[in-house]
């Protein structure tokens, strides 16, 4: 029977006994930076080319006995998970291995850097098809390792890494914290985050998605036909490297940004039990388990968006937090969140020729997060229209006035420490969907975009008194680009997008004893691209 | 994912202008920084990645490495250039005493220096 992990990543309609995945990643080369491997194991023979690259530290301990099967164990298993004949994800992918970890599974940042440089030079000498680099290793936060990963990613290489097995914030580790790398956490057969002894999978905003990483059957270096079960975020990363190889083989022209968006889009949503994560990390950690797309083509028409959280701003009065999109992505909206509720909103601003999302802390606040909604929108021309505080009783308004521009997101930012809490919320006049409405003492920022065939609409959902959270979702075929709260309440902690749902969090008045009757309204901006839909129909 | 996390140790070593007239002063207003792993047991002191500014050519990297060796030798320190980086990042990997960090940070083209550290199979 099919191992649980392969079943989990396989779309239901492909689970028949006869299913053979199309070409299985045959156009892609996967580089593995790990231990030595037993390349003639029956699972992977002929699939893995062992390069002559080796940069490893001496093993610790005077009595260390170098036993081949132990030295090869980690790398052989991962090669099997990526491309093994019977237990592999991308059965057609070819691999190249570089030895950067010694027989005890230990390496150095410098050895890994030299390995990444070796890959770049190989790519320049002999350009091949798409490249995936699997980094099933982690060390402490390293500026230089992250920088090298960024350079390699910008050269068109897809890097996939383990989030780390430290039951900790993945942002404290490298290469897991590198924004350009696809960082993978581990889940088990019950869709629980993986526990490993007293530790377990890392989590947090630096994790892109999770994948199977417990009791994963794969090639064992103990003998040439042996299999063994191993667990860890390395195994999870190997699944995503395999899925990436399959996707790139089907669509070799995919950019890193497109691939990441597809991995997120086709993931199983909201299946992970978040109670395992520390409470302050739950909102930051993506509830996504990787899966293969239901078919190899036809995803191109979709407007893909993802949510990117910033680092925490820190608690100082003027502290700010910045969330950035990847170079190929458009920032379509910007929101903010503070657990204490003390914040001064957010704004979209240009930085180095690109829009970023900046959130502002308030006096007495414990800090804020900026939340960017990052989308793939070809030929987009986006700009931010700002209205300063109106001081008028009706509140501040701003709309997209340029011909053909549609509203994709609304942000508001205020200098006063506490927006007037006694003011009733301002309701948007009907029939004017292309405008943002805000508190009279706030600056309002509208994200206005022009792109072929782009159409957007506003959806609202309000409840009479704050009850923890209000949500509003975009319907099938539409993608959430903007998420904000209608103004006028002191209870709102912030707004953020979770997949296609806009979540507005507020203090629960039932627990604070407040008698306020203020409504909290979640405002979602839902968009779709008729141009992308037409383009994909023409291809088929 | 941001690369601006403040949760790793950063030591900014101030430049002492009166020391070592041989070193070309870095461009005005820029200070090279030193980084090391926040997890002490994972640190590998004695080996350092010297990262040079983005547009530095291979020949300049090699020249900077040689200059470090020469200046270290004048102070009675042995150094060993283990690798010169080019292709991804300009720079070099050097085995040397931590006593030489202040000197190394003053070298021309230096962006930052990072102490080597361990990585582990996951």
């Amino acid at each position: 029977s099919i191992p649980w992990n392969l079943e989990r990543i396989t779309p239901p309609r492909y689970r028949a006994d006869e299913y053979q995945p199309p070409d299985g990643g045959s156009l892609v080369e996967v580089y593995l930076l790990d231990t030595s491997i037993q390349s003639d194991h029956r699972e992977i023979e002929g699939r893995v080319m062992v390069t002559d690259f080796e940069n490893v530290p001496e093993e610790d301990g005077t009595r260390f006995h170098r036993q081949a099967s132990k030295c090869d164990s980690h790398g052989t298993h991962l090669a099997g998970v990526v491309s093994g004949r019977d237990a592999g994800v991308a059965k057609g992918a070819s691999m190249r291995s570089l030895r950067v970890l010694n027989c005890q599974g230990k390496g150095t940042v410098s050895g890994t850097l030299i390995g990444l440089e070796f890959i770049r030079k190989s790519q320049l000498v002999q350009p091949v098809g798409p490249l995936v680099v699997l980094l099933p290793l982690a060390g402490g936060y390293s500026r230089v390792l992250n920088a090298a990963c960024q350079r390699l990613a910008r050269a068109g290489v897809v890097l996939v890494t383990a989030a780390g097995n430290f039951r900790d914030d993945a942002c404290l580790y490298s290469p897991a914290s590198a924004p350009e790398v696809i960082t993978v956490g581990a889940t088990n057969a019950q869709d629980q985050p993986v526990t490993l002894g007293t530790l377990g999978t890392n989590f947090g905003r630096c994790v892109d998605l999770f994948a199977p990483g417990e009791d994963i059957i794969g090639a064992s270096s103990y003998c040439s036909t042996c299999f063994v079960s191993q667990s860890g975020t390395s195994q999870a990363a190997a699944h995503v490297a395999g899925i990436a190889a399959m996707m790139l083989s089907a669509e070799p022209e995919l950019t890193l940004a497109e691939l990441r968006q597809r991995l997120i889009h086709f993931s199983a949503k909201d299946v992970i039990n978040e109670a395992w994560f520390p409470e302050d990390q739950r909102v930051l950690t993506p509830n996504l388990v990787a899966a293969l797309p239901p078919s190899t083509h036809g995803a191109g028409w979709q407007l893909f968006c993802r949510t990117v959280w910033s680092a925490h701003s820190g608690p100082t009065r003027m502290a700010t937090a910045i969330a950035r999109c990847a170079p190929d992505e458009e920032l379509l909206s910007c929101s903010s969140f503070s657990r204490s509720g003390k914040r001064r909103g957010e704004r979209m601003e240009a930085q180095g020729g690109k829009l970023v999302c900046r959130a502002h802390n308030a006096f007495g606040g414990e800090g804020v997060y900026a939340i960017a909604r990052c989308c793939l929108l070809p030929q987009a021309n986006c700009s931010v229209h700002t209205a300063p505080p109106a001081e008028a009783s009706m509140g501040t308004r701003v709309h997209c006035h340029q011909q053909g521009h549609v509203l994709t997101g609304c942000s508001s930012h205020w200098e006063v420490e506490d927006l007037g809490t006694h003011k009733p919320p301002v309701l948007r006049p009907r029939g004017q969907p292309n405008q943002c409405v805000g508190h009279r003492e706030a600056s309002i920022h509208a994200s206005c975009c022009h792109a072929p065939g782009l159409e957007c609409k506003v959806k609202e959902h309000g409840i009479p008194a704050p009850q923890g959270q209000v949500t509003v979702a975009c319907e099938e075929g539409w993608t959430l680009t903007g998420c904000s709260a209608l103004p006028g309440t002191s209870h709102v902690l912030g707004a953020y997008a979770v997949d296609n749902t806009c979540v507005v969090r507020s203090r629960d008045v039932s627990t604070t004893g407040s008698t306020s009757e203020e409504a909290v309204t979640a405002v979602a901006i839902c968009c779709r691209s008729r141009h992308l839909a037409q383009a994909s129909q023409e291809l088929q | 994912q941001e690369d601006e996390d403040g949760d790793y140790e950063e030591l900014v070593l101030a430049l002492r202008s009166e020391e070592d007239g041989l070193a070309e002063a870095p461009e005005h207003g820029t200070t090279a920084t030193f980084h090391r792993c926040a997890k002490d047991p994972w640190r590998l002191p004695g080996t350092y990645v010297v990262v040079l500014k983005e547009e530095t050519h291979l020949s300049q990297s090699e020249r900077t490495a040689r200059r470090l060796q020469a200046q270290a030798a004048r102070r009675g320190y042995l150094t060993k250039i283990l690798h010169v980086f080019h292709g991804l990042l300009p720079g070099f990997l050097v085995k040397m005493s931590g006593d030489l960090l202040e000197l190394a940070l003053k070298l021309p083209h230096v962006d930052y220096i990072e102490e080597d550290s361990s990585v582990f199979a996951q």
Epitope: D40, E45, V48, V50, K91, C223, S224, T225 | -
Partner: antibody, heavy 115, light 110 residues
Framework: QIQLVQSGAEVKKPGASVKVSCKAS????????ISWVRQAPGQGLEWMGW????????NYAQKVQGRVTMTTDTSTSTVYMELRSLRSDDTAVYFC????????WGQGTTVTVSS | QSALTQPASVSGSPGQSITISCTGT?????????VSWYQQHPGKPPKLMIY???NRPSGISNRFSGSKSGNTASLTISGLQAEDEADYFC?????????FGGGTKLAVLR
């Protein structure tokens, strides 16, 4: 090109031993082991075992376990298969083939066991 | 006695299609993706025609195709040609070894 070249025919008496060689070329040897397969006259194919060029590990079929020894000489890229205590039913053509996938075959070595 | 069962012989006229079956158990054919098919002409070594159930090595005509359902694998040859007349063997992984079928003699009727 990828080639497996085997040694010449052998005639042996019952109880004797035979050692057949197989020289590999044209590919990365450590990416594949070598399988040995035999075929008795007019019969089907029988897998005898496998040896690793990477670490010398072996995997023998139960039927010949104890009588067969496979070895490698990495300096000459050659694999050897020795079969001891020969019997008349060991008369066959012995083939070496690349890996478990057996995608490339040697030309075969005829071993005749006869008193 | 071979572990995998194949028909002793099959025949077909030029241009026709034939299918050779290879039946095993869940411990071999049913349990692995690694079923191969070999063609052997008299006095020659076997030649790999299909690997991993349905893949063709480069240089092998697309008239040869493979499939698997449950514990039975099949080789189909379409547009039969005189040079297809040969013995055909299937093979599969088992947990620790390899196993072959007894072979099928294909006759192309003149």
């Amino acid at each position: 090109q990828i080639q497996l070249v085997q040694s010449g025919a052998e005639v042996k008496k019952p109880g004797a031993s035979v050692k057949v060689s197989c020289k590999a070329s044209g590919y990365t040897l450590t990416s594949y082991g070598i399988s040995w397969v035999r075929q008795a006259p007019g019969q089907g194919l029988e897998w005898m075992g496998w040896i690793s060029f990477y670490n010398g590990n072996t995997n023998y079929a139960q039927k010949v376990q104890g009588r067969v020894t496979m070895t490698t000489d990495t300096s000459t890229s050659t694999v050897y298969m020795e079969l001891r205590s020969l019997r008349s039913d060991d008369t066959a053509v012995y083939f070496c083939a690349r890996g478990y996938g057996m995608d490339v075959w040697g030309q075969g070595t005829t071993v005749t066991v006869s008193s | 006695q071979s572990a995998l069962t194949q028909p002793a012989s099959v025949s077909g006229s030029p241009g026709q299609s034939i299918t050779i079956s290879c039946t095993g158990t869940s411990s071999d054919v049913g349990g692995y993706n690694s079923v191969s098919w070999y063609q052997q002409h008299p006095g020659k070594p076997p030649k790999l025609m299909i690997y991993e159930v349905s893949n063709r090595p480069s240089g092998i005509s697309n008239r040869f195709s493979g499939s698997k359902s449950g514990n039975t694998a099949s080789l189909t040859i379409s547009g039969l040609q005189a040079e297809d007349e040969a013995d055909y063997f299937c093979s599969s992984y088992t947990s620790t070894s390899m196993v072959f079928g007894g072979g099928t003699k294909l006759a192309v009727l003149r």
